[in-house]
């Protein structure tokens, strides 16, 4: 594709190529033949992040706590605001339009991965010699006690929901 | 004082192409774009597309594009318009413009005759 | 594309009337609206680009006006040599698109 009759940073506008804005700016007047591309900085709270003719600045996200929300970044003229979750809650989209709680791992399962900001708790079943016997976003499988290291002997075997129970070594032997 | 001046007028065959040229003075020849049109007998004025001669840029209309180039010559400032496959339709005269706010200085035209 | 209809698209009239053309685009075309003489024979001039400036060397007889999607060319006093056909064209979005025009006689 041969470059269009305007450069970059540049546009076509009643046969002349004017500048376009910079990031932060919007357009007030079009360029003419006498007379440069007019702009102006964007308001408190708007932002323009490409070089552009828009005649509006966008308005900065905002980071609502009635869904959760918690500014992360503060948005500038040239950025938008960046929103996370409140602690214990992630965002239910790229766009982190709104917050969930983070979910916990039930009894037989183990947090694999802690929640962040912007991902839920991953959880993995507890594997022969693991357990975990609570509901938490927090609490990885833990490994049934080793009776033997304690010179005790396994009285009942563990599951995935419960550790093993040690005992005495039987003294009649 | 600003003139483009176009070369003489064309008959071509069908299927032909056809090259007009638009010979600009009294200007910066690079610091304004140079816009083609053209005028079928009787009609109104339909745009072809635009050239930077800076550095040769340009943008078409969809109706012509893959049929039109436009090129430009800036060591003799002149701009070149340039139809294929020509169609009886295609008749017209053409027009080349200097832009700025506007078609600010138009070229006499060239009558382009496309006929068996 | 944008279209332009341009009314009417001829009249007659008299040397010192006031002539007015009008022109309306399909959709908003931002002020980007110029105005073209055009006389048989002759090159096509400019006579007002932007809605309403007035090119160099255009009596003040001419004017422009208008926004959105509505434009008009004023001759206040129609002069022997203002007898020609009348187009306009937006400059706002590419293609480029001109009205029909509007052929001017003597009445």
């Known amino acids: 594709e041969p470059p269009t009759a305007c450069r970059e940073k540049q546009y076509l506008i009643n046969s002349q190529c004017c500048s376009l804005c910079q990031p932060g700016q919007k357009l007030v007047s079009d360029c003419t033949e006498f007379t440069e591309t007019e702009c102006l900085p964007c308001g408190e709270s708007e932002f323009l992040d490409t070089w552009n003719r828009e005649t509006h600045c966008h308005q900065h996200k905002y980071c609502d706590p009635n869904l959760g929300l918690r500014v992360q970044q503060k948005g500038t003229s040239e950025t938008d605001t960046i929103c996370t979750c409140e602690e214990g809650w992630h965002c239910t989209s790229e766009a982190c339009e709104s917050c969930v709680l983070h979910r916990s791992c039930s009894p037989g399962f183990g947090v694999k991965q802690i929640a962040t900001g912007v991902s839920d708790t991953i959880c993995e079943p507890c594997p022969v010699g693991f357990f975990s016997n609570v509901s938490s976003a927090f609490e990885k499988c833990h490994p049934w006690t080793s009776c033997e290291t304690k010179d005790l002997v396994v009285q009942q075997a563990g599951t995935n929901k419960t550790d093993v129970v040690c005992g005495p070594q039987d003294r009649l032997r | 004082q600003v003139q483009l001046v176009q070369s003489g007028a064309e008959v071509k065959k069908p299927g032909a192409s056809v090259k007009v040229s638009c010979k600009a003075s009294?200007?910066?020849?690079?610091?304004?774009?140079i816009e083609w049109v053209r005028q079928a007998p009787g009609q109104g004025l339909e745009w072809i597309g635009v050239?930077?001669?800076?550095?040769?840029?340009?943008n078409y209309n969809e109706k012509f594009k893959g049929r039109v180039t436009l090129t430009a010559d800036k060591s003799i400032s002149t701009a070149y318009m340039e139809l294929s496959r020509l169609r009886s339709d295609d008749t017209a005269v053409y027009f080349c413009?200097?832009?700025?706010?506007?078609?600010?200085?138009w070229g006499q035209g060239t009558l382009v005759t496309v006929s068996s | 594309d944008i279209q332009m209809t341009q009314s009417p698209s001829s009249l007659s009239a008299s040397v010192g009337d006031r002539v007015t053309i009008t022109c309306r685009a399909s959709?908003?075309?931002?002020?980007?609206l110029n105005w073209y003489q055009q006389k048989p024979g002759k090159a096509v001039k400019l006579l007002i680009s932007?809605?309403?400036r007035l090119h160099s060397g255009v009596p003040s007889r001419f004017s422009g006006s208008g926004s959105g999607t509505d434009y008009t060319l004023t001759i206040s006093s129609l002069q022997p040599e203002d007898f020609a056909t009348y187009f306009c064209?937006?400059?706002?979005?590419?293609?480029?698109?001109f009205g029909q025009g509007t052929k001017v006689e003597i009445k």
């Open positions: 413009a200097r832009g700025g706010s506007g078609f600010a200085f």
């Open positions: 009294g200007y910066g020849f690079t610091n304004y774009l």
């Open positions: 050239i930077n001669p800076g550095y040769g840029g340009v």
């Open positions: 959709q908003d075309i931002s002020n980007h």
């Open positions: 932007s809605t309403s």
């Open positions: 064209q937006q400059g706002n979005t590419l293609p480029w698109t």
